[in-house]
């Protein structure tokens, strides 16, 4: 077929959609022209397993991102709600526009979020010291609308001062109790999430939370005997 | 400011149709119907996709259609061979697709219009 007469525009370079949580953004390095006083603008498409493409705007998708200068494009940014739905195939797409020129689209691979997330730490992490005990609260990395579709387990990595570093999990739950520890003894400890995706047995194992230590409480009946 | 207008509720007798519709002030992704009955928590009955694709509650399937006419942005809701249980307020929604798809939460809704199922 013969080239297309007004796409004669260089294509955006270099387009990475960021799968953090529950961030879903692409972007992408600015197209340059030397010779053009007018800002190029972008316009990105979306198309999920079997649908046609549709522009990614305000109606569609919660977010404008057609005809932007931006160089990046964040679905999730309107709220914690905005954006694909985790378990959608989606494919990307995106060009640069100038008046009646435009660039070649340039297509990203397609991804779903359960699958290609890169899942952070727990959040608000609170311990609480007890007699030869922690016991441990915090808050999922993001939420999940259905838990019957995914859901996350959680892990903790745990060691006495000095000591050698133990496992314990996974658990549903976001309450956790380190039981049958020493008394007046200081323990560090990281906890993890594990995002499971019941539909295509996948799982993501995330970050580890930033190392903490705690020093137990003294066994009651020591005290007593002081 | 988004505007969801419905109209076509009333009385109808049991086995008879009602044609719901509902305007909306833009070209949003999902259009669908819930509804709520008495004492009871709102439901999704039917909603549309841009795509075409279209979803049903069980308790509607085979009785109730919903289409949409793209170009005037409007979404109805075909009711057929109604029963006594579809009594209840019926909402219009819409929004745009989100990771509130399944359950789906829409970003808007309208202010409902009543339609009551006689024996």
């Known amino acids: 077929a013969p080239p297309d007469p007004l796409s004669q525009l260089p294509a955006p370079q270099h387009p990475k959609i960021r799968l953090y949580n529950a961030e879903q953004v692409l972007s992408w390095e600015p197209v340059a022209l030397s010779n053009s006083t007018r800002p190029v603008v972008y316009q990105v498409q979306f198309k999920y397993t079997d649908s046609k493409w549709f522009t990614a705007d305000i109606m569609s998708i919660g977010v404008n991102c057609t005809q932007i200068t931006a160089t990046e494009c964040d679905f999730t940014a309107a709220s914690p709600s905005a954006g694909f739905p985790m378990d959608f195939n989606v494919t990307l797409r995106l060009r640069a526009e100038l008046g009646a020129l435009h660039s070649a689209w340039v297509t990203m691979p397609w991804f779903q979020h359960y699958r290609n997330v890169t899942v952070g730490p727990p959040e608000n992490i609170e311990v609480t010291p007890g007699e030869g005990s922690l016991i441990i609260r915090f808050s999922s990395p993001f939420d999940i609308a259905d838990t019957s579709t995914a859901f996350f387990c959680y892990y903790v990595h745990y060691w006495e001062k000095g000591g050698i570093q133990q496992v314990k999990g996974p658990f549903r739950s976001n309450s956790i109790s380190l039981d049958n520890l020493k008394p007046s003894r200081v323990y560090c400890l990281q906890v993890q999430a594990q995002l499971l995706w019941n539909k295509s047995n996948i799982f993501r194992v995330g970050h580890l939370s930033n190392i903490s230590c705690y020093e137990t409480m003294a066994d009651a009946s020591t005290e007593l005997q002081q | 400011q988004v505007q969801l207008q419905e109209s076509g509720g009333g009385l109808v007798q049991a086995g008879g149709s009602l044609r719901l519709s509902c305007t909306a002030s833009?070209?949003?992704?999902?259009m669908g119907w819930f509804r709520q009955a008495p004492g009871k928590q709102r439901e999704l009955v039917a909603r549309t996709i841009r795509d075409g694709t279209t979803d049903y509650a069980d308790s509607v399937k085979g009785r109730f259609t919903i289409s949409r006419n793209t170009a005037e942005n409007t979404a109805y809701l075909q009711m057929n061979s109604l029963k006594p249980e579809d009594t209840g307020v019926y909402y219009c929604?819409?929004?745009?697709?989100?990771?509130?798809?399944?359950?789906?939460?829409?970003?808007?809704w309208g202010q409902g219009t009543l339609v009551t199922v006689s024996s």
């Open positions: 929604a819409a929004g745009p697709l989100s990771k509130s798809f399944a359950p789906w939460d829409p970003a808007y």
């Open positions: 833009g070209a949003y992704f999902i």
